[in-house]
Each structure stands twice: as C-alpha cells, then as structure tokens.
Amino acid sequence: EVEKTACPSGKKAREIDESLIFYKKWELEACVDAALLATQMDRVNAIPFTYEQLDVLKHKLDELYPQGYPESVIQHLGYLFLKMSPEDIRKWNVTSLETLKALLEVNKGHEMSPQVATLIDRFVKGRGQLDKDTLDTLTAFYPGYLCSLSPEELSSVPPSSIWAVRPQDLDTCDPRQLDVLYPKARLAFQNMNGSEYFVKIQSFLGGAPTEDLKALSQQNVSMDLATFMKLRTDAVLPLTVAEVQKLLGPHVEGLKAEERHRPVRDWILRQRQDDLDTLGLGLQG
C-alpha cells in the first residue's frame, strides 16, 4: 500500500506521458488521477514503467473500480494485465473478442497462466458456447487449448466451430475428449465427399465407433498407422482382418512394427491365426 500524501506543487499529471517514469511511487499515487488513467490506458504500454510503478497504477484502478474494470479499460490494459490476479479477472465481464485478443497478445509465447485461463473461462462462459471465431482465436494462441477442456466443457462446442480445429490442436486430447469431439466433427463434415471427408475427420477418429471404421474401410481411405494407433480399443477389436486390411490399404505392412503396441497388440491377440496369415506379415495371435 502507498501512503496518501499530497501531490507536490506543479506535479499534478494532466495526461499519461513519459514524464511519469521519473515519479516516485508515492508521487504517482498522489498526482495521477485514477479517472485520467482509465481514459488514457492505451498510453501506459508505450511508457517504460517499472514493475513497482505498474503496481501503483493497478492500485489506482482497483480503487476506482472495486467491482471490476469496465471493458473499455480492460481492452487497453496491455502489460498491466500481467499484474492482475485470477481473483481480479473474475470480477470482469469481457464480451469483445478484440479485448480477448489484446490480452492474449500480452501473454503470447508463454504457457497459459492462471490469469489467462481465468480470462478465457470468463469470456467463454459469458458467450455461452465456444463459437468458431473464439475457438479460432484461442487455438491460434494456444494450440493445446481444446485439449485442456474437460469433456463436459467440450460438449458446449457447436459442430460449426469444428471447422476452426486444426490437426495439431488435437495432439494432446485424450480418448474421452475425442469421444465428445468426434460426433460433432462427423456432423460438421457430413456433406463432404469421401476423400475430402477423410482428410477432415482423420484427426478426430480417436473417438470413432466400430461401425464408422467399418464404413471407412469400404472407401479406400488408406489410413496411416499413426491414426490407427489412436483409435479406440473397443472400436478396433471387432474389426476383421479383411476390414483392417482395407482400412489401412498400403499401410497395412506397418502393423508388424506396431505388433507389441496397443491397440494393435490387442487386435492381433483376438484374431484367428489363419486370418492373420493372409496378411503375410508374420503376425502371431
């Protein structure tokens, strides 16, 4: 806390400018009007304030807006955002995607902080669902964002938003998350033709049921082994040797290299040896 002291004569700030970097903490507290700061927040980022000085500026805003900052101030917080606690952010009502982008830009290149996580949570809850533009923005800043959500949170993602998802956005998703996302992707891409559909749906197939894999096996899709290895065990086990051969196409030879790994191992174990022998790969059931 900075003590309340009178502003020295001639030091009263008329605007937020570089002269303020020479002010001591107590002078900033005494001489900068909080309302002036709020209206000129966009200038703060252009001025090389010390962390201690930024603490004072935050304190002034906290006093002016004890119930939480208005969005007009939040949008221009810039590096002052890094001084905010999750508790501060929970008081905010952020509705503009531009505001969200501006604050994410401040944290760019770093892992998602508790502050950013809270900000995103507030924003998404305010919107009611993860729309395409929001998802586009979040995955651009944090490719792993989608996979950081619980299956329950993912259920609020509308199928239309799935178009914004890139394969790398799903890299760290676990099977339970893909179980939620796959039906949405299937719905989103349902009007595409066979080969185009497979390209889009491929990243989501870790949530696909057996019947969908059987259907894909009839379409000459040539699934690669990396995708096959991510399929649900319960979806793979009922597939016949012939179906797996059709599903993988020329990639079927890759089964040999993965025979000790799941789910390939689980599938091999449950096939008739005579059927496995038709592949000519030396797989032992």
Epitope: D174, P175, R176, M229, K230, T233, D234, L237, R260, H261, R262, R265, D266, L269, R270, Q284, G285
Partner: antibody, heavy 119, light 107 residues
C-alpha cells in the same frame, strides 16, 4: 462378481520350479476382453509384471524372466497357472494373479500368496 | 522396456491436503497409463485407467491427467483411508512395467 484365488506351495527350494495356480470364479477365463496375468512383489519392494495368457493360449512374458517362465491356461477348469524354473532367493515374493481387462487394466486381483525360496 | 519413473518416492501430508504424484515414461505411451493404490498386506486396487478415467467405485477426489510421457495422479482432498502406496503402470508396450511407487504417509 469375478474373484481370483492363488494356490500353490509357500516354500520352494533353490534351483527348483515354482508352480502356482489361479482359479477364476464368478466369470470365465475364456472372456473375449480379458487376459490373465501374474505379478509379483518382493518383500518391501515394488510390483513386477511376470506375464499374461489369453484363453486361446497366446502368451506374453516379461523379457527379463522369459527364459524361465511358462504360463498356461485350462479353460475346462477355469484356471491359469505359472511355472518359474531355476528359482533363487531373489524370486522370493508375494505372487498375485490378476485380470487384465483390455479397456481398463488390472481391475481384479487375487489376494496374493507368499512364496519363499529357501533350502 | 519402457521405464516408468515416479516422483516423489514418498511424501508426508495431512488430511484435507491436495496431493499430486507424477509418473514419467521413458517414451510415449499415448494414454495407456493406469494408477493403483496398495495398502500394507493387501493386493493393489485399480484407481485410474487410460490416464484419466475413474474406475467404477473409486471416489471422485482421485483424478488422473496426462498423455505421451508425463502423467499426474491428484487426490484433491486427502482422506485418512488414502494413506497408502501408489503405483503407475504402462500397458502400451507388450512388456508391462510399473513405476517404483509413491508412499503417502501421515504428516
């Protein structure tokens, strides 16, 4: 519900063969989804997986024990068995049989049987 | 073989504490990671399978996360009956391996 029960001698002499049987009750050893494992735990130490068998007779063993281990299954008796040859004092442990459900893991265990290797 | 490294090997905690145990695989094991609880003189008990799925009958204070090589078991609010040894186990590779265990003791 499925239960497992280990049986066999509690004392084996060095260089001899350790033999244990696990009896499955309340379920079938011929289950499509399950393999049947043996796991051991030396006194005061961690868990070591020995190997598993599928009802078809397919087996998979821990590479470090493979040369000494044989696991077999008797579907008519609803049992599976472990044989560990050329035992030494280092094989003294609590031996567990367990069901390995393909979707979950070792979800059902026997209560364990202590086997001591000593002359 | 895939090596599983657990940390810490032991920890002291109080009832009500949040406890986190980590498990690292020497290579990627996707989500094929299970967690077990073992009490003295008893067989292990499955808590979490497939890295994050709660086994039927296990209290919701237990949760698991992670994929690839790094995994975490969290007990959100430690209860008296939770003092035990915890093991992770990979089932991705045909040669199953367990972590060395983490003993959770009363502070």
């Amino acid at each position: 519900q499925v239960q497992l029960q280990e049986s066999g001698p509690g004392l084996v002499k060095p260089s001899e063969t350790l033999s244990l049987t696990c009896t499955v009750s309340g379920g079938s050893v011929s289950s499509f989804t399950d393999t049947w494992s043996w796991i051991r735990q030396p006194p005061g130490k961690g868990l070591e997986w020995i190997g598993y068998i599928y009802y078809s007779g397919s087996t998979n063993y821990n590479p470090s024990l493979k040369s000494r281990v044989t696991i077999s299954v008797d579907t008519s008796k609803n049992q599976f068995s472990l044989k560990l040859s050329s035992v030494t004092a280092a094989d003294t442990a609590v031996y567990y049989c367990a069901r390995d459900n393909v979707f979950t893991g070792f979800d059902i265990w026997g209560q364990g049987t202590m086997v001591t290797v000593s002359s | 073989d895939i090596q599983m490294t657990q940390s810490p090997s032991s920890l002291s905690a109080s009832v009500g504490d949040r406890v986190t145990i980590t498990c690292r695989a020497s290579q990627s094991i996707s989500s094929y990671l299970n967690w077990y609880q073992q009490k003295p003189g008893k067989a292990p008990k499955l808590l979490i399978y497939a890295a994050s799925s709660l086994q039927s009958g296990v209290p919701s204070r237990f949760s698991g996360s992670g994929s690839g090589t790094d995994f975490t078991l969290t007990i959100s609010s430690l209860q008296p009956e939770d003092f035990a040894t915890y093991y992770c186990q990979q089932s991705y590779d045909a040669s199953y391996t367990f972590g060395g265990g983490t003993k959770v003791e009363i502070k």
